[in-house]
């Protein structure tokens, strides 16, 4: 368990032309607040997805009203730290998302209006218990300066807050004030206790009894804001004549520069010259380079052209954001025409077309039934932009490719026996019944109930087979004509069907990839 802490130092227009003068809209005054969102590991989720490690919201900052013709200042910020408690292990690598929100205080119907002013997203590596890490990030025309750290809460200790320190009954082999640490008996650890009175907000320590100050603060307990007034050039105790507080010890005492940086004094403060690969006030920030793999989702990392931009990510299709961390919903652009269904497969976009349309974006209208090949002598019927097949006897399904069993529905009434025939079906009626479906009872005197069967077609009539044979020949002739017609049409438009089948196959394969 532990706490992630974020300190916002400044938020304001970035350098260069075209910087915004005010965060507020023309509707009047506004105030700022911040939201921090933490995601564990090498998350590639969009910023909108849940903040699995936790999130926090700052208080509202002071009301800001733009001063006409005044230089755009750093904007008034909410007081205090943003703290995100975490229950489990600190992951070490995490995504840090900081959002700057604007609350408009003009006459809004239904209360204040909120809008997102800027969002920075960075993948970072950070050990718990380490010093404050500094960062400067640009979001559009805005610049955000902040520091952050992760600290364990006792009894948790270690860089991941996974080890528990607890007193043991055995005699301690550790030095005074230190406790044996479970589970490793030969390890003794305690979080550094800063110098008594060291500011919790503006100071930190890496060694017990130390008090190091964040940028903008000075003094032995980091209580003194660094001012540009001339009194800061003085050395010695507080100057009662000027009303300025001046720190006694020199700012480079104890070398506040980390990672091998060298310290040089400046009026009332100090300056670190950092070795290659480090930056920040005390060289405490390790410069993220392309070798760190800062681009999510396989994005291409390119070294930035200017010193402020350590790298630029060139994102794969379907991703955007400064670190390629946001998934683009490409289907929201409705690329599929004619009512096609859009499928964003991540690495590619596919359209599943409605019947009667084909092509990568369903742009081809398969008119005149051209693309709807009806098999086995079926005929294509158009209607309302859709196409359907009217199948020949004995066939069914969308394209008449399925052989239908005409006897499956038991069409012969009164116990008649059904025989499947290539032209349809034939019913052999039970004694006492007649008709195509054995639907008519035969009266004992040989006369059927209405409608009467014509002479020569009574049950058992020897001419019946001959008549059926004639009907069969006629049906064959008709079917043959239809088949010839369909084949010529099928050949003419076969390429469309092939393209559509290939497209469907590819889509199926990619969806299963």
């Amino acid at each position: 368990a532990g706490v992630f802490e974020l300190q916002i130092h400044s938020f304001g227009p970035g350098p260069g032309p075209g910087a915004p003068r005010s965060p507020c809209s023309a509707r009047g005054p506004c105030r700022l607040f911040f939201r921090v969102c933490l995601k564990p590991g090498l998350s590639e989720e969009a910023a909108e997805s849940p903040c699995a490690l936790g999130a926090a919201l700052s208080a509202r900052g002071p009301v800001y009203t733009e001063q006409p013709e005044a230089p755009a200042p750093d904007l008034p910020l909410p007081n205090g730290l943003l703290q995100v408690p975490f229950r489990d292990a600190w992951p070490g690598t995490f995504s840090l998302i900081i959002e700057t929100w604007r609350e408009e205080l003009g006459d809004q119907i239904g209360g204040p209006a909120w809008s997102l002013l800027a969002r920075v997203t960075r993948r970072r590596r950070l050990a718990a218990g380490g010093p404050w890490a500094r960062d400067i990030q640009r979001a559009g025309a805005w610049e955000l300066r902040f520091s952050y750290r992760a600290r364990c809460e006792l009894p948790a200790v270690g860089t991941a807050c996974t080890r528990l320190c607890r007193p043991r009954s055995a005699p301690s082999r550790c030095g005074p004030g230190l406790r044996p640490c479970a589970p490793l008996e030969d390890e003794c650890e305690a979080p550094p206790v800063c110098r008594a009175g060291c500011s919790l907000e503006h100071g930190f320590c890496e060694q017990p009894g130390e008090c190091r100050c964040l940028e903008g603060w000075t003094g032995p307990l980091c209580m003194v804001p660094v001012s540009t007034s001339s009194c800061l050039g003085l050395r010695g105790p507080s100057s009662t004549t000027t009303g300025c507080l001046v720190p006694g010890p020199g700012p480079c005492d104890g070398n506040p520069c980390a990672n091998g940086g060298s310290c040089s004094e400046t009026p009332g403060s100090f300056e670190c010259t950092c070795p290659r690969g480090f930056y920040g006030l005390r060289c405490e920030v390790s410069g993220v380079t392309c070798a760190d793999g800062p681009c999510f989702n396989g994005g291409l990392c390119v070294g930035g052209a200017d010193p402020d931009s350590a790298y630029i990510c060139h994102c794969p299709p379907g991703f955007q954001g400064s670190n390629c961390e946001k998934r683009v919903d490409r289907c929201s652009l409705q690329p599929c025409r004619n009512g096609g269904l859009c499928l964003d497969l991540g690495h590619a976009l596919r359209c599943r077309c409605r019947a009667g349309f084909a092509g990568p974006r369903c742009e081809h209208d398969l008119d005149d039934c051209a693309g709807r090949a009806c098999a086995n002598g079926g005929t294509c019927v158009e209607g309302g932009g859709a196409h359907r097949c009217s199948c020949a006897l004995g066939f069914g399904g969308r394209n008449c490719r399925e052989r239908a069993d005409p006897c499956a529905a038991r069409p012969c009434a009164h116990g008649g026996r059904c025989y499947a025939h290539f032209s349809g079906l034939v019913c052999a009626c039970a004694p006492g019944y007649m008709g195509a479906r054995c639907e008519f009872p035969v009266h004992p005197d040989g006369v059927s109930a209405l409608p009467a069967a014509p002479p020569g077609l009574r049950p058992g009539d020897p001419q019946r087979a001959g008549v059926i044979a004639v009907i069969v020949v006629v049906v064959i002739a008709i079917v043959a004509g239809i088949v010839v017609l369909v084949i010529s049409r099928k050949k003419r438009m076969a390429k469309y069907e092939k393209a559509e089948i290939k497209e469907m196959g590819e889509m199926h394969r990619e969806l299963n990839a």
Epitope: L42, S43, G293, L300, P360, A513
Partner: antibody, heavy 117, light 107 residues
């Protein structure tokens, strides 16, 4: 300096197996997608397969020509990616390169695989 | 898969010449095209990404252009170290596919 070093190539009979390794240095390996790309003698480049990150559950993707025969794995603790090649065919003869990312930005020097009876 | 057709397959040029290599995609690939340089016995090196952006450390004489289906790599003034084989690759649709290569030889 970023370095990718492939090893494990050699001569193998058709139907045989081979395991290639690619050791990375100079990069935070666990943050990079890794690919294998091959080049048959005197021919162009052909993407073989890819393995993504732990956060992607080490998802793998393969070219149709090797699907079911080749397997890519990675060991982030060792900064190494592997290509296990089974049921090798003569047409698998090539120089095999490991590369990073979606756009193949860093490349190894390659290792030669010869499949011949 | 998207096919990338590169032309010419080889060309002869002299130091100082302006050289143009073209690549045609079988379907629209936006600007998701990269160019690679490969010298004999060496691994390919990324030159251009996003159709027209030079990768880190690539000399300014190399430039790329195009979008959709037609792409061009231009070497404004050929240098002795530029004699190599050049490949285009599309990254719009998975899997990535490459052109057949263009060998630039000394005239």
């Amino acid at each position: 300096e970023v370095q990718l070093v492939e090893s494990g190539g050699g001569l193998v009979k058709p139907g045989g197996s081979l395991r290639l390794s690619c050791a990375a240095s100079g990069i935070t390996f666990s943050n990079f997608w890794m690919n294998w790309v091959r080049q048959a003698p005197g021919k162009g480049l052909e993407w073989v397969g890819q393995i993504r990150l732990k956060s992607d559950d080490y998802a793998t993707h393969y070219a149709e020509s090797v699907k079911g025969r080749f397997t890519i794995s990675r060991e982030d603790s060792k900064n190494t990616v592997y290509l296990q090649m089974n049921s090798l065919k003569t047409e698998d003869t090539a120089v095999y390169y490991c590369t990073t990312g979606y756009y193949f930005d860093y490349w190894g020097q390659g290792t030669t695989v010869t499949v011949s009876s | 898969n998207i096919q990338m057709t590169q032309s010419p397959s080889s060309l002869s040029a002299s130091v100082g010449d302006r050289v143009t290599i073209t690549c045609k995609a079988s379907e629209n690939v936006g600007t998701y095209v990269s160019w690679y340089q490969q010298k004999p016995g060496k691994s390919p090196k990324l030159l251009i990404y996003g159709a027209s952006n030079r990768y880190t450390g690539v000399p300014s004489r190399f430039s790329g252009s195009g979008s959709g289906t037609d792409f061009t790599l231009t070497i404004s003034s050929l240098q002795p170290e530029d004699f190599a084989t050049y490949y285009c690759g599309q990254f719009y649709s998975f899997p990535s596919t490459f052109g057949g290569g263009t060998k630039v030889e000394i005239k």
